[in-house]
């Protein structure tokens, strides 16, 4: 599968391969998470919409020195077409709403599993 | 705690269709993949099919050549496999499936099956 | 389609014993193995996921291995109640498929 069903997006769509690889890793932070992620950190909020992957990346690339989500941050700049650096800013985020990041991830986890299923079975 | 509570046993002439409930419990349905599962007197397991409840797209084994149909109603969380152009052999109990696929597998939770006898 | 060949289709086996059950895929199915445990009458109940995770519950006894395309699932020391149908599933890519199934008896 290399397009996932209701998901338009401005470059490419990651195969099902690699759409359930980030997945498994959002799942082990979850599962591993221990103190609070990150110490807490915050970042933007994303509308979970077309061009999620670039915008999930510019929030979470503004979080340094957390190794928990490196491989994350490194997954995510495959997905996404351009160059990513921090202090972007996408109009995909929620300029007023900062969350934690482990409700970042959290959220994100969700949807990319609600993806996963649409491109499943569509 | 996770249910899944399916119709009961049912009693069909040949050509005839059956549609057997699975209604769930205990998650939110759309969360999760749903699956139906054969298995034949004294034989193993066959996956049928599956679908996925929020969107209603459908997946299926091609050996039930178009005789299966799956569905879900997402207002009675409960959902459907119908089986049609029924023969002898489809004589089986019918397993409903669901689990979060990256938690505890697609097959994590079983309904308690119906028992379908195809008989003239 | 991929195909699962589960071995031995039955075996017999004493309390205490150790037993493993393997499975073969005729592809790569990315540790997507599921396995799980039949009695006469009851529906399959789910034992291990993801090829070697232990479902919630389940005792520690049983465990799971393998990758690429050979599965394993072993059982340290048989228990009574042990004494069940075991079926491999690889959930990598439609159509889902199963092994034929392993008969565990009592020696």
């Known amino acids: 599968l290399t397009c996932l069903g209701g998901f338009a997006s401005p470059g490419p769509v990651p195969p099902s391969t690699a759409l359930r690889e980030l997945i498994e890793e959002l799942v082990n932070i979850t599962q591993n998470q221990k103190a609070p992620l990150c110490n807490g950190s915050m970042v933007w909020s994303i509308n979970l919409t077309a061009g999620m992957y670039c915008a999930a990346l510019e929030s979470l690339i503004n979080v340094s020195g957390c190794s928990a989500i490196e491989k994350t941050q490194r997954m995510l700049s495959g997905f996404c077409p351009h160059k990513v650096s921090a202090g972007q800013f996408s109009s995909l985020h929620v300029r007023d709403t900062k969350i934690e990041v482990a409700q970042f991830v959290k959220d994100l986890l969700l949807h990319l599993k609600k993806l996963f299923r649409e491109g499943q079975f569509n | 705690e996770v249910q899944l509570v399916q119709s009961g046993a049912e009693v069909k002439k040949p050509g005839a269709t059956v549609k057997i409930s699975c209604k769930v419990s205990?998650?939110?349905?759309?969360?999760?993949?749903m699956h139906w599962v054969q298995q034949a007197p004294g034989k193993g397991l066959e996956w049928m099919g599956g679908?996925?409840?929020?969107?209603?797209?459908?997946a299926s084994n091609q050996k039930f050549k178009g005789r299966v149909t799956i569905t879900a109603d997402k207002s009675t969380d409960t959902a459907y496999m119908e089986l049609s152009s029924l023969r002898s052999e489809d004589t089986a109990v019918y397993y409903c499936?669901?689990?979060?696929?990256f938690g505890g597998g697609p097959f994590a939770y079983w309904g308690q099956g119906t028992l379908v006898t195809v008989s003239s | 389609d991929i195909q699962m060949t589960q071995s031995p289709s039955s075996l017999s086996a004493s309390v205490g014993d150790r037993v493993t059950i393997t499975c073969k895929a005729s592809?790569?199915?990315?540790?997507?193995l599921s396995w799980f445990q039949q009695k006469p009458g009851k529906a399959p109940k789910s034992l291990i996921y993801?090829?070697?995770r232990l479902v919630d519950g389940v005792p520690s006894r049983f465990s799971g291995s393998g990758s690429g395309q050979d599965y394993t699932l072993t059982i340290s020391s048989l228990q009574p109640e042990d004494f069940a149908t075991y079926y491999c599933?690889?959930?990598?890519?439609?159509?889902?498929?199963f092994g034929g199934g392993t008969k565990v008896e009592i020696k």
């Open positions: 499936a669901t689990g979060d696929y």
């Open positions: 205990g998650y939110t349905f759309t969360d999760y993949e």
């Open positions: 679908i996925d409840p929020e969107t209603g797209g459908t």
């Open positions: 592809q790569d199915i990315n540790s997507y």
């Open positions: 993801r090829a070697n």
């Open positions: 599933l690889q959930y990598d890519e439609f159509p889902y498929t």
